[in-house]
Amino acid sequence: ECVTQLLKDTCFEGGDITTVFTPSAKYCQVVCTYHPRCLLFTFTAESPSEDPTRWFTCVLKDSVTETLPRVNRTAAISGYSFKQCSHQISACNKDIYVDLDMKGINYNSSVAKSAQECQERCTDDVHCHFFTYATRQFPSLEHRNICLLKHTQTGTPTRITKLDKVVSGFSLKSCALSNLACIRDIFPNTVFADSNIDSVMAPDAFVCGRICTHHPGCLFFTFFSQEWPKESQRNLCLLKTSESGLPSTRIKKSKALSGFSLQSCRHSIPVFCHSSFYHDTDFLGEELDIVAAKSHEACQKLCTNAVRCQFFTYTPAQASCNEGKGKCYLKLSSNGSPTKILHGRGGISGYTLRLCKMDNECTTKIKPRIVGGTASVRGEWPWQVTLHTTSPTQRHLCGGSIIGNQWILTAAHCFYGVESPKILRVYSGILNQSEIKEDTSFFGVQEIIIHDQYKMAESGYDIALLKLETTVNYTDSQRPICLPSKGDRNVIYTDCWVTGWGYRKLRDKIQNTLQKAKIPLVTNEECQKRYRGHKITHKMICAGYREGGKDACKGDSGGPLSCKHNEVWHLVGITSWGEGCAQRERPGVYTNVVEYVDWILEKTQAV
């Protein structure tokens, strides 16, 4: 059962796993949620009745019964992890803590104009977990405006003390605000021989990479496959670091794979959710329960629904045995990974899907698309919305994309002459415009946020956000698309599609069925040659065939240019402008979304 509220002056007795330091009870709850075993916690706030050495302690706890006896204690705040909850979870913590010094290894000291600049520096430094900034009121003159970047083994402070005129905070890497590169390549037949901070067992290099991504100290990894010559090291995942942040030593070695933490791209690819099944593979660990199940999928469901289950092994039924049901072994370990992985015993293994809610919803796989044809099918572009105006009569105005449960990203030029958000309606999960009737449910628009540098589509900044009056419940037919990662600026997208209900030729009408067209991206240099009278800036991106024939057109504006990369769809562009439609040597011009990620996050994450 999901309990979100905090229990004041209450302490949970027993069940201790470990103690960490956090600046608030709220953050203690987040740390507990991300810990592989923590189900409950007790935080000690600062209080005259408490020993100062116990202030800010966050004791992570576990219990077989999922609860523990409660004891009254002043200054203690207790609560439950969000593991038991179904809502989306984020580790993003933008809070700034005044008069608190968060202790760690101070590895970098520099002057900064403000705490915000210090936090940005921390966010863009590969090693930084948190920072402390001495304000200009700090008593010691030589320490004023000093920004200390810090890291620890756990990613949380080793101690927190009160200190006047300083502020502390965390890196915003988990808020998708880092400019660090996102290197997704996995290098075959390569060992990184740098320092190991931990080792775990993993079924493949992808899981190893995801484990590295959410391990606070891991910057890159090496994985020994099941064909690795040394049996005792098969399926071993080595989590690594180095002073420079990059591997200093790459050695060619067959049956090993290496790669990098995906910390800088974690909002646009799954890093917690290990959804694959591993056939003829047994995961060893502490047994939680053995249950009868019809299939390995059913076994995974059982594991996902058992809050303490981390992974499972399913042994299929022997013929005509136990009504065709196999055995489902629900398991756990201290770090969330199997203690050993065995092959050739006939088991089917996998992980709980409970952690999937820690990933961005936009990374969820959607159903396979229909190749060929121009009409879309239901659920093919679940982020696409149709934006209607009701004035003077109701009609389709523009496209848009769901990027969050209360947010639509679209083009600024759609709102020319729109005086009030009250006349707007957002319809999601729509394939045919004819589905929209008087009684069709829609989302009202609470606010239109247009980029303040927008003047006209051709001069750029053609981007706007719609804040919805109510939240979108994600389903197969309405779900968000990922924003591109700032670290992905150099990615060459090859699978890009433009969608919309717009005209199919210059003089036409709005289409009934959502149309789709696969369109290649064009370099900005090439695009500039085609539009000599305009300035094609880096904040624009172009797409189109040299010979024309496929393009966005009137009515598609504001809709997505969606590109698939590493099995995840990204909102690379927003349909903005072009000369005519599908004309030869006149590519469509789109708002280059990656250049506006900071703006989007600033507006959507504002408190």
Epitope: V191, N196, S199, T222, K230, Q233
Partner: nanobody
Amino acid sequence: QVQLVESGGGLVQPGGSLRLSCTASEFTFDDSDMAWYRQAPGNECELVSTITSDGGTYYADSVKGRFTISQDNSKNTMYLQMNSLRAEDTAVYYCAADQWGSAEGDCTSSYPGGYWGQGTLVTVSS
């Protein structure tokens, strides 16, 4: 019980040479990746050289052209021939088997199936 024993360390003048040996017991070199690591006082453990089971060799940039790694499988022994020694080569040298990287900067075992010797001190000083 796997044991790796280093020998050959000592005091040598700058420009001099030393040959380190590492002998293994309860363990065969044939299918193992062997390496020499070193740790100078106050520094992290660093990889000096590796010889892989398929005969490939690797050298850290700082020792390239001066150090040579080799092994004699019949004697279950690995060697590090160190020439043109410099003051900055002063460190404790460790022999390691199937050990790809140190444990958080220290020359100690960090994961299953990896082994370390006790180390031998090399001092380069005039």
